[in-house]
């Protein structure tokens, strides 16, 4: 029986409107119907949880109403979006997949995806 | 900083039953998963299983399913575990622990010591 | 259940000396494999997690290594505090424990 794999990309920049968005995909041992993916992010060998959501194989990810995530999935594949990211958020952010039910339970971490943020530069102010 | 403060010793009859505790501080109690792990004097560690404070989801040790129940009180940020139908094999140190957000066990209490014994 | 052993019970060593403590995984575990330190009395405390990254604090003499179902921990310029059983730990699936290796002056 093969270790639960969990691949991301290494680097992400994010958009001009601090949006980043990257696929998180796994290789499951075994047959789950219950999946609980969390994000973190890791800077100066703090982590922290970034946001986290259960969905049953097939449904939708439902993240709370406040996370700044959002997300869908195909399969053993989640395509995570993280949103209102500014400069100070550089960092690398974690892809941690739990295969919740049916026993047993597996754990599989990525080697996490280093999102570079830049703050947009504020407009001139245009005189008419 | 995080610690985990575990009650004190217990000496209990057999058949009898006992609820430890794990009192936790220094970090945001609903965020990380509550292991027990056993310990018998001289021999290794054994995972008796976790739960998850924010929503009270238990997964335990195929072993300990029915000797061991987890509860959390996240008013006192208080892990218990309670050990029923109490033998000989029970006497052991039983630690608490804290889940990392990567996996591993980060931080320990210091242990409980429970001697069954008639 | 993944079993993990620790082939060596007992490790003899002397102050200075680097020394290899082994552990085997029954099955592939990736890189999520911790080792811990514990003292006679004590808890243990954690001091490598994901096979090869040292927790908070950790002196740089303790280093983990392997993947799959071969790992290592070592102590390079053994300390007298260092003295102590050592306990690998897989956290892929359900967490399992080694039996232990005691590290104890030659």
């Known amino acids: 029986c093969k270790a639960m794999h969990v691949a991301q990309p290494a680097v992400v920049l994010a958009s001009s409107r601090g949006i980043a968005s990257f696929v998180c995909e796994y290789a499951s041992p075994g047959k789950a119907t219950e999946v609980r993916v969390t994000v973190l992010r890791q800077a100066d060998s703090q982590v922290t949880e970034v946001c986290a959501a259960t969905y049953m194989m097939g449904n939708e990810l439902t993240f709370l109403d406040d996370s700044i995530c959002t997300g869908t999935s195909s399969g053993n594949q989640v395509n995570l979006t993280i949103q209102g990211l500014r400069a100070m958020d550089t960092g690398l952010y974690i892809c941690k997949v739990e295969l919740m039910y049916p026993p047993p339970y597996y754990l599989g971490i990525g080697n996490g995806t280093q999102i570079y943020v830049i703050d947009p530069e504020p407009c001139p102010d245009s005189d008419f | 900083q995080v610690q985990l403060q575990q009650s004190g010793p217990e000496l209990v009859k057999p058949g009898a039953s006992v609820k430890l505790s794990c009192k936790a501080s220094?970090?945001?109690?609903?965020?990380?998963?509550i292991n027990w792990v056993k310990q018998r004097p001289g021999q290794g560690l054994e995972w008796i299983g976790w739960i998850h404070p924010r929503d009270g989801s238990t997964e335990y040790n195929e072993k300990f399913k029915g000797k061991a129940t987890f509860t959390v009180d996240t008013s006192s940020s208080t892990a218990y575990m309670e050990l029923h139908s109490l033998t000989s094999e029970d006497s052991a140190v039983y630690f608490c622990?804290?889940?990392?957000?990567?996996?591993?066990?980060?931080?320990w209490g210091q242990g409980t010591t429970l001697t069954v014994s008639s | 259940d993944i079993v993990m052993t620790q082939s060596h019970k007992f490790m003899s060593t002397s102050v200075g000396d680097r020394v290899s403590i082994t552990c085997k995984a029954s099955?592939?575990?990736?890189?999520?494999v911790a080792w811990y330190q514990q003292k006679p009395g004590q808890s243990p405390k954690l001091l490598i997690y994901?096979?090869?990254t040292r927790h908070t604090g950790v002196p740089d003499r303790f280093t983990g290594s392997g993947s799959g179902t071969d790992f290592t921990l070592t102590i390079s310029n053994v300390q007298s505090e260092d003295l102590a059983d050592y306990f690998c730990?897989?956290?892929?699936?359900?967490?399992?424990f080694g039996a232990g290796t005691k590290l104890e002056l030659k």
């Open positions: 994901w096979a090869s």
């Open positions: 220094g970090y945001t109690f609903t965020s990380y998963d």
């Open positions: 730990q897989q956290y892929s699936s359900y967490p399992t």
């Open positions: 099955q592939d575990v990736g890189t999520l």
């Open positions: 622990a804290r889940r990392g957000l990567l996996g591993p066990l980060d931080y």
